[in-house]
Every structure is written in structure tokens, then in C-alpha cells.
């Protein structure tokens, strides 16, 4: 029986050109984590494997840094980075746990505009 739960950073927004940390936390299970995958929709971004360490997909090497911890840092954000991100924890004996994060990348002017006209 799978007892674990994944807590994620949820829905987040960031400014174009900036960076953001994606984080997931698996708790409430004694299952052994063997690998953590980070995916963007259907694309693999990175893997952290118990025996092999980190692997960053070649197409993201310049813009993705591992960590902190089992998280992932996305840099030099573009509007095209907007979308769903998934952390996939492979565990034994439980199986797979998946967490979802939605990232919205805002145009700098939009972010500034929103901040300037916030209702107190």
C-alpha cells in the first residue's frame, strides 16, 4: 500500500530572464527512493539516481542546475517555459510517486505592472 505523499511548490510565477527553484518533498513513507525524475510535460529535464548522481538532458544543460537537494533550478526563463512540471519519485517497494508544479513565466513589464497596481 502506498502511504507516501508529495508536497510541491504548487503554482508559481517568475519573471522572464530570471530563475526559479522547483521543489518536491516525499514524506510519510519508509520506502527507499532510488531515483527522482524531473519532467516538463513530455520532456525529460533531469534525473537524480542513487548510483549515478545527476544527469541533465543535453537540451537543457545551459539553463538547468541541480539542487538545492533534490530540487531543480531553472535559469534564464523564457515565456515558453510556462507550463506543467513533474517530479517523479521512484521508490522501493512502493513504486512511483508524482508531484505537479505549474510555472507561469511573466513578461518583465507584466510582472512590474502587476506589482505596481496591487490593491493594498
Amino acid at each position: 500500500m502506498m502511504t507516501g505523499t508529495i508536497e510541491t511548490t504548487g503554482n508559481i510565477s517568475a519573471e522572464k530572464g530570471g530563475s526559479i527553484i522547483l521543489q518536491c518533498h516525499l514524506s510519510s513513507t519508509t520506502a527507499q527512493v532510488t531515483q527522482v525524475n524531473w519532467e516538463q510535460q513530455d520532456q525529460l529535464l533531469a534525473i537524480c539516481n542513487a548510483d549515478l548522481g545527476w544527469h541533465i538532458s543535453p537540451s537543457f544543460k545551459d539553463r538547468v542546475a541541480p539542487g538545492p537537494g533534490l530540487g531543480l533550478t531553472l535559469q534564464s526563463l523564457t515565456v515558453n517555459d510556462t507550463g506543467e512540471y513533474f517530479c517523479i519519485y521512484h521508490t522501493y517497494p512502493d513504486g512511483t510517486y508524482t508531484g505537479r508544479i505549474f510555472l507561469e513565466v511573466l513578461e518583465s513589464s507584466v510582472a512590474e505592472h502587476g506589482a505596481r497596481f496591487q490593491i493594498p
Partner: antibody
Framework: QVQLQQPGSELVRPGASVKLSCKAS????????MHWVKQRHGQGLEWIGN????????NYDEKFKSKVTLTVDTSSSTAYMHLSSLTSEDSAVYFC??????????WGQGTTLTVSS | DIVLTQSPATLSVTPGDSVSLSCRAS??????LHWFQQKSHESPRLLIS???QSISGIPSRFSGSGSGTDFTLSINSLETEDFGMYFC?????????FGGGTKLEIK
């Protein structure tokens, strides 16, 4: 098997600089963060900073930013920590440690740095 | 920076006893908390990762629990080799930080 090899000791003069080394073997050097940790007189542990050899990305504790520079030589699988303008406060044991899926899973034996005239 | 507070600073116990060591985080670090043992003139050794993940080669008498701000390392039926310093460490955000340590000594 995974090993992190550090020199046992270094003796340097106040005001000088030193470059401590940590030679990794038994794993793919570029796939793991390497961290450096300071311990004075058998007291607590202080995180200095880290470097990801796959990209050269570094992070430092603010306290050590002006004191420390972390580098790697991927061809020899060696991590380096350069400490500048040494004082007696820098006398300590310095450990390198690898961060994997299970956090700091392997540690070097530590280098005892003595700053004395 | 995240602050980790360990208590007690020193714990005097008898072999065979069971003990619980505490590590309190401020602010919340979810489950990004790790436990290390260090004996005199040795390197630290990883005991538990991510609050409760067991580590290969570590005796089963060591276990970890907690999430958020309160964490516990439990050692069942202490053996003489278990005496030494114990540190917690967080990897939720940079800069990583360590707790001040708990010294486990023989009564």
C-alpha cells in the same frame, strides 16, 4: 568504491593563501555536487559552499564569499578550495563531501589547516 | 538562512538505553533534514537522509522522523560504538546549514 582523498595537513603563514585539494575516484565526478565544510577544534560543522563539476556552478555561504574560491579540474577529478588572506581564525579541519540522492553520502578524511608564523 | 537548533547539547546515557535527539528548524524545511554521526578525529557519517530515509550499512537501531520544523533521531538499545557527536543538516535551500550538535556520552 567511492573515495575522496585529501592531504592530511597544511601549514601556512598568516596573510598567505592556500589551495586545498580533494581528489575523487570511484564515480562520475561531473554528476555530483562537491561541498566543503569547516570544523574548528572539534566543534560544530560549518557549510562553506559547493560546486557542481558538470557546469562549474557554485554557491557560497555569505560568511565565506570573500575568503574562499571553489574550482574543479574535471580531467583529474579533483576539487579545489582556495583560501586567501589567512588568519588564525582559518585554522581548522576542512572536509570535502559529495552530495548524492542521499545527501552527503561520502566524506574525505579532512585536511588540518594550521595558520601560524 | 535556515537555523537548526539541536537539543539537548549533551546527553549522558547508559549502553542499552534508547534515546531521542531533537533538531528544530526555522523556518519550515519540509523533509530536507539529514543526520550525521561523528566520532573524535573522524569524518562525519551519514545516518539518515531526508528525515526518515535509511542508509545502506547503517544499523537498523537508527531511525529518523519528523517533517517541517521538528525532527527526531531515535537510537534503540545504544551500543558503546554509538557514543559521539550527532549533527543535523538541511538541504532545503542554500546556504546549507548544520545544527550545533548533540554530544552523546556514557553515563
Amino acid at each position: 568504491q567511492v573515495q575522496l582523498q585529501q592531504p592530511g595537513s597544511e601549514l601556512v603563514r598568516p596573510g598567505a593563501s592556500v589551495k586545498l585539494s580533494c581528489k575523487a575516484s570511484g564515480y562520475t565526478f561531473t554528476s555530483y555536487w562537491m561541498h566543503w565544510v569547516k570544523q574548528r577544534h572539534g566543534q560544530g560543522l560549518e557549510w562553506i559552499g559547493n560546486i557542481y563539476p558538470g557546469s562549474g556552478t557554485t554557491n557560497y555561504d555569505e560568511k565565506f564569499k570573500s575568503k574562499v574560491t571553489l574550482t574543479v579540474d574535471t580531467s583529474s577529478s579533483t576539487a579545489y578550495m582556495h583560501l586567501s588572506s589567512l588568519t588564525s581564525e582559518d585554522s581548522a579541519v576542512y572536509f570535502c563531501t559529495r552530495e548524492g540522492l542521499y545527501a552527503f553520502d561520502y566524506w574525505g578524511q579532512g585536511t588540518t589547516l594550521t595558520v601560524s608564523s | 538562512d535556515i537555523v537548526l537548533t539541536q537539543s539537548p547539547a549533551t546527553l549522558s546515557v547508559t549502553p542499552g538505553d534508547s534515546v531521542s535527539l531533537s533538531c528544530r528548524a526555522s523556518p519550515n524545511i519540509r523533509n530536507s533534514l539529514h543526520w550525521f554521526q561523528q566520532k573524535s578525529h573522524e569524518s562525519p557519517r551519514l545516518l539518515i537522509s531526508y528525515a526518515s530515509q535509511s542508509i545502506s550499512g547503517i544499523p537498523s537501531r537508527f531511525s529518523g522522523s519528523g517533517s517541517g520544523t521538528d525532527f527526531t533521531l531515535s537510537i534503540n538499545s545504544l551500543e558503546t560504538e554509538d557514543f559521539g557527536m550527532y549533527f543535523c543538516q538541511q538541504s532545503n535551500s542554500w546556504p546549507y546549514t548544520f545544527g550545533g550538535g548533540t554530544k552523546l556520552e556514557i553515563k
